[in-house]
């Protein structure tokens, strides 16, 4: 077989026929260097996702219950290509799992025991396993027969197709639990008609039922949906407040040699030939002689997943979790009030070694998990290996992105109610040796600059959103000669001047030395003409303050501010003369974790805060030698955030207009493959 | 700060047992925290267990219930029994204090722990 062919596989013999067809009509539109495809047949999806992993098949479109079994191991599968639903300027790549009830109700999410349940089938995924799934820890015990445990949670329910003989709860509110339209409770509109007419107290349906089913927006405010955090919202906020984010079909691959950018040219070049009408003679869409062979019927069209997008996170953390809870059915031992220790992510071995540390002193309150980079702990906060870690100001727009939200804020000044009082935020400012006295911010072109790494506030968004204003394009690496910007391309100009040995090159994390706010201002004093960082950074590296061989003689007079006014100004005065004001460090985790990471946090500070004064007897949670590992040094408590708990609201308009605009140049795989999820 | 030596290592079957010792040049009494990591061919070094000045311990779930660590201040040593050993626990053993920071790799040479029959 040629390298550029796509094994496709088909899992019956009207699959088969219709995969010979596109093999056939491909080769008549496509040049012969270019993809082909060969069909291989299985006898079912399971068969199919052992022959891609096995390299005997290349590519299948499946639901998302078949993707997670296509992620687990031994498979390693992974999503590559999206179909999507609705138009090409609105695409619908996912729908929600939502639970519908009267406004006037008065319940929670938890405190559905006892309540009357309606279904829209038994074993289907918005109407019972992403539901059952999420509430399978609260169901009596013994939790196997399901069902049974299912009808003795809730007080009577409708779930169409279950065995009304064995299990007559789950069809009280439907006789019989007929399997068809011929049951009136049948599906996601026979669902929503159970709550309706009164029947039921809850529906488990997608987010699009309740306007397929109510045109007036008059009927559909009588109705509110059940958050996860134990809220309610109108139905038409359906993104903030669901069970879960369910793809609706994907094409999966090997995650390893699996031919991800080959299957996506083909697809690509095939909707664009035998897409939504395009041809008569073979339509991608259609299945004359069946339903959904290949692709859906209802799809118009494909988009590629982004490569940064592994099962987990394209399924989301909600689906995986309620599927995971079916299959395995193992739960906490007794669910309790009490907090599970709240797992932290430490990067590289430096923060990992705090971390330990902080996990000994901690009494099993505090675990530790470790990423290379920002944005593979953020990718574990949202996937659940990981819990929490404090954030830049650039990174909790990416976390926020992602889901996650703000939970306690870095605030940096002594005050009386220090936890009471979030702080207005610090200054990023721009940093140049007194004896470049030539050098303003309005001639940095051809300058070697010190980065404290990209998508960081003080260090990129805001000088390279400046800059972006001024030169209108994102070639950075060109403006200046060079620099060091960890988490720049390792060929960029932007990891010349940078220090790490071998890989650790240019890394974004304290294997790189010049890496975070000392080590942008240690590339200044070393190799630099400018670095971007906070106000504190020049005094807390210099005077002696900082005992390192690099800095132990470095005096605070021999450095000056760039103001953006085109003059210079002494270090001290960087309230009139900085780049702008940026949102403080903050600790981010998932919505489900928020109560917990700040009742934790705000124990763990008092224990180990900047209450403590003796830090070499004794372990200090907000000191590192300057290094600002997991918190920043210079913290001296971590502050409610009162109203300020989502990303926006904490950022600020300001600040997150500024890093939108950013976003074109932006090359986070992650802000990518979130905003694929959630545009 | 205190200079670490660690002894106690050697090969030993499956399900055996071995005392690890961490002799220190000086007094551990006003040392908080004290732990015993591990480091296999290939693999980063793991926190093993953990012990505060106060006697807290923690473990890594792997060897919950089969190591023990202790500190005995008065003779400025740290210990980790190490009972019904595994193929998996073979690994060069390192102790710290963590008092020269998180920054700096100062870890000394280790005592090599071999399971195997």
């Known amino acids: 077989v040629p390298d550029k062919t796509v094994r496709w596989c088909a899992v019956s013999e009207h699959e088969a026929t219709k995969c010979q067809s596109f093999r056939d009509h491909m080769k008549s539109v496509i040049p012969s260097d270019g993809p082909s495809v060969a069909c291989v047949k299985k006898a079912s999806y399971l068969d199919c996702i052992r022959a891609i992993a096995a390299n005997e098949a290349d590519a299948v479109t499946l639901d998302a219950g078949l993707v997670y079994d296509a992620y687990l191991a031994p498979n390693n599968l992974k999503p590559v290509v999206a179909e999507f639903y609705g138009s090409k300027e609105d695409p619908q790549t996912f729908y929600y799992a939502v639970a519908v009830v009267k406004k006037d109700s008065g319940f929670q999410m938890n405190q559905l025991r006892g309540k009357k349940s309606c279904h829209t089938g038994l074993g289907r995924s918005a109407g019972w396993n992403i539901p059952i799934g999420l509430l399978y820890c609260d169901l009596p015990e013994p939790r196997k027969p399901l069902e049974k445990a299912v009808a003795n949670f809730f007080s009577g329910s409708c779930a169409p197709c279950a065995d009304g003989t064995d299990f007559p709860q789950l069809c009280q509110l439907c006789p019989g639990c007929g399997c068809s339209t011929l049951n009136q409770y049948f599906g996601y509109s026979g669902a929503f008609k159970c709550l309706k007419d009164g029947a039921g107290d809850v529906a488990f349906v997608k987010h699009s039922t309740i306007f397929e089913n109510l045109a007036n927006k008059a009927d559909r405010d009588q109705y509110e949906l059940l958050c996860l955090d134990n809220t309610r919202k109108p139905v038409d906020e359906y993104k903030d407040c669901h069970l879960a984010q369910v793809p609706s079909h994907t094409v999966v691959a090997r995650s390893m040699g699996g031919k991800e950018d080959l299957i996506w040219e083909l697809l690509n070049q095939a909707q664009e030939h035998f897409g939504k009408d395009k041809s008569k003679e073979f339509q991608l869409f259609s299945s004359p002689h069946g339903k959904d062979l290949l692709f859906k019927d209802s799809a118009h069209g494909f988009l590629k997943v982004p490569p940064r997008m592994d099962a987990k996170m394209y399924l989301g953390y909600e689906y995986v979790t309620a599927i995971r809870n079916l299959r395995e059915g193992t739960c906490p031992e007794a669910p309790t009030d009490e907090c599970k220790p709240v797992k932290w992510c430490a990067l590289s071995h430096h923060e990992r070694l705090k971390c330990d540390e902080w996990s000994v002193n901690s009494v099993g309150k505090i675990e530790c998990v470790s990423a290379e980079t920002t944005e593979d702990c953020i990718a574990k906060i949202m996937n659940g290996e990981a819990d929490a870690m404090s954030l830049d100001g650039g990174f909790v727009y990416i976390a926020g992105k992602c889901g996650l939200v703000p939970v306690l804020a870095e605030n940096y000044n002594k005050s009386d109610n220090c936890e009471d009082t979030p702080e207005a935020g610090y200054f990023a400012i721009a940093v140049v040796k007194k004896s470049a006295s030539d050098l303003t911010w309005d001639n940095l072109k051809g300058k070697k600059s010190c980065h404290t790494a990209v998508g960081r506030t003080a260090g990129w968004n805001i000088p390279m959103g400046l800059l972006y204003n001024k030169i209108n394009h994102c070639r950075f690496d060109e403006f200046f000669s060079e620099g060091c910007a960890p988490g720049s391309k390792k060929d960029s100009s932007l990891c010349k001047l940078c220090m790490g040995s071998g890989l650790n090159l240019c890394e974004p994390n304290n294997k790189e030395g010049y890496y975070g706010y000392t080590g942008a201002f240690r590339c200044l004093v070393e190799k630099g003409d400018v670095a971007f960082v906070k106000h504190q950074t020049v005094p807390q590296n210099t005077g002696g303050k900082n005992p390192d061989p690099w800095a132990k003689n470095l005096n605070e007079k021999d450095y000056e501010l760039l103001c953006l006014d085109g003059t210079r100004k002494p270090v001290e005065e960087y309230a009139n003369c900085h780049l702008a004001r940026a949102p403080n460090h903050a600790v981010v985790t998932r919505k489900d974790k928020e109560a917990c990471v700040h009742k934790i946090l705000r124990q763990q500070q008092h224990l180990f805060g900047s209450n403590v004064t003796d830090c070499s007897g004794n372990f200090c949670l907000f000191r590192s030698e300057t290094k600002d590992l997991l918190f920043r040094d210079d913290t001296v408590c971590l502050a409610k955030l009162h109203d300020r708990n989502t990303y926006e609201k904490y950022l600020g308009e300001e600040y997150v207009k500024a890093v939108g605009n950013l976003r074109k140049c932006s090359t986070s795989s992650l802000l990518e493959a979130c905003t694929f999820r959630r545009p | 700060q205190v200079q670490l030596v660690e002894s106690g290592g050697g090969l030993v079957q499956p399900g055996g047992s071995l005392r690890l010792s961490c002799a220190a040049s000086?007094?551990?009494?006003?040392?908080?925290?004290m732990a015993w990591y591990r480091q296999a061919p290939g693999q980063q070094r793991e926190l093993v267990a953990g012990?505060?000045?106060?006697?807290?311990?923690k473990y890594a779930d792997s060897v919950k219930g089969r190591f023990t660590i202790s500190r005995d201040n008065a003779k400025n040593t740290l210990y980790l029994q190490m009972n019904s050993l595994k193929p998996e626990d073979t690994a060069v053993y390192y102790c710290?204090?963590?008092?020269?920071?998180?920054?700096?790799?100062?870890w000394g040479q280790g005592t090599q722990v071999t399971v195997s029959s």
């Open positions: 710290t204090d963590y008092s020269r920071g998180y920054y700096q790799d100062y």
């Open positions: 000086g007094s551990i009494a006003s040392i908080n925290t």
């Open positions: 012990i505060t000045r106060g006697g807290s311990t």
